[in-house]
């Protein structure tokens, strides 16, 4: 038995962030489960982590220097990407893990979203100005 | 048949580190969870942690600063190392399978006596 | 931590007898309709061994004059008929919550 995962295809984030939404066929209220989002088509870097248990505050972090944060919905988990840079415009997963109570499930690979980072810029100068006026 | 092997008998000094492996043998050991559950002398059962087919591991709070569970699927091979040894961590080190999903463990280890004295 | 408490922590029986184990958790183990807790028998020197899964359901090649009961908090093993191969520690585990805890042991002793 597998989890299936929904997100969208792909996201634009023009001010070098993004709400990335990950939509589980599995109701996560009272169960402790850990959520991660993976950048890569190998998702060999894990992007940010929630872990989620009946007793404590929702726990959010990264290990890879991404600034993240999470929500969590009974059905879903928003991740919350801020400072992304042109260069991490990539491919990302959910991921899902419910360790308690059993079964141990995690979930079917999911198709990913392109996260399409866009960087900041100033208004662009005009390409042609035309004749300066003395 | 089904069984779970374990490595033999260690003796370690305070502050070093020891690991245990588990063989599996007559089943699919990719397609189950493997625990770890300790027993000091005279005591009673210790859950250590596990590991699931999915390769993720869970650790007990008491033991996660010390304790690596990883599994080898080419060889069927759980391992279960433990670090900064202390005097209190002499036990019977068990690994064992479950079977139902409810994480009952079914099928067990003969045991691992690590012994800690300096 | 859910903690087990089982009672007695010892006891003497004879062949024959009917002996009853309780152990109760600190807080419920249910979930869905199944009740995450586990007994097992451990003969000194060899490893546990699986008696009762989800608190009723014997395991397979286990004699069915072990039987298991119980739900929320309260759990009982009973052996109908104690065996001389019956004398052993029997334990019970929930696996409900993270960490997995087990009760203290209930030692079955020869009168």
């Known amino acids: 038995n597998k989890i299936l995962v929904k997100q969208s295809p792909m996201l634009v984030a023009y001010d070098n962030a993004v709400n990335l939404s990950c939509k589980y066929s599995y109701n996560l209220f009272s169960r402790e489960f850990r959520a991660s989002l993976h950048k890569g088509l190998d998702s060999a870097v894990e992007v940010c982590v929630v872990y989620g248990n009946y007793s404590q505050q929702l726990q959010v972090y990264s290990k890879t220097g991404f600034n993240c944060d999470g929500k969590l919905g009974n059905e879903s988990v928003t991740f919350y990407l801020q400072n992304l840079y042109v260069n991490q415009t990539d491919i990302y997963f959910c991921k899902i893990e419910v360790m308690y109570p059993p079964p141990y499930l995690d979930n079917e690979k999911s198709n990913g979203t392109i996260i399409h980072v866009k960087g900041k810029h100033l208004c662009p100068s005009p390409l042609f100005p035309g004749p300066s006026k003395p | 048949q089904v069984q779970l092997v374990q490595s033999g008998a260690e003796v370690k000094k305070p502050g070093s580190s020891v690991k245990v492996s588990c063989k599996a043998s007559?089943?699919?050991?990719?397609?189950?969870?493997i625990h770890w559950v300790r027993q000091a002398p005279g005591q009673g059962l210790e859950w250590i942690g596990s590991?699931?087919?999915?390769?993720?591991?869970y650790y007990s709070p008491s033991l996660k600063s010390r304790v690596t569970i990883t599994a080898d699927k080419s060889t069927s091979t759980a391992y279960m190392e433990l670090s900064s040894l202390r005097s209190e961590d002499t036990a019977v080190y068990y690994c064992?399978?479950?079977?139902?999903?409810?994480?009952?463990?079914?099928?067990w280890g003969q045991g691992t006596l690590v012994t800690v004295s300096s | 931590d859910i903690q087990l408490t089982q009672s007695p922590s010892s006891l003497s029986a004879s062949v024959g007898d009917r002996v009853t184990i309780t152990c109760r958790a600190s807080?419920?183990?249910?979930?869905?309709?199944?009740?995450?807790l586990h007994w097992y028998q451990q003969k000194p020197g060899k490893a546990p061994k699986l008696l009762i899964y989800?608190?009723?359901s014997l395991e397979s090649g286990v004699p069915s004059r072990f039987s298991g009961s119980g739900s929320g908090t309260d759990f009982t093993l009973t052996i109908s008929s104690l065996q001389p191969e019956d004398f052993a520690t029997y334990y019970c585990?929930?696996?409900?919550?993270?960490?997995?805890?087990f009760g203290q042991g209930t030692k079955v002793e020869i009168k």
């Open positions: 064992a399978r479950d079977v139902y999903g409810s994480y009952a463990l079914d099928v």
């Open positions: 007559g089943f699919t050991f990719s397609s189950y969870a």
């Open positions: 590991i699931y087919h999915s390769g993720s591991t």
């Open positions: 807080q419920s183990v249910d979930f869905d309709g199944i009740s995450f």
């Open positions: 989800d608190a009723s």
């Open positions: 585990q929930q696996s409900y919550r993270s960490p997995i805890t």
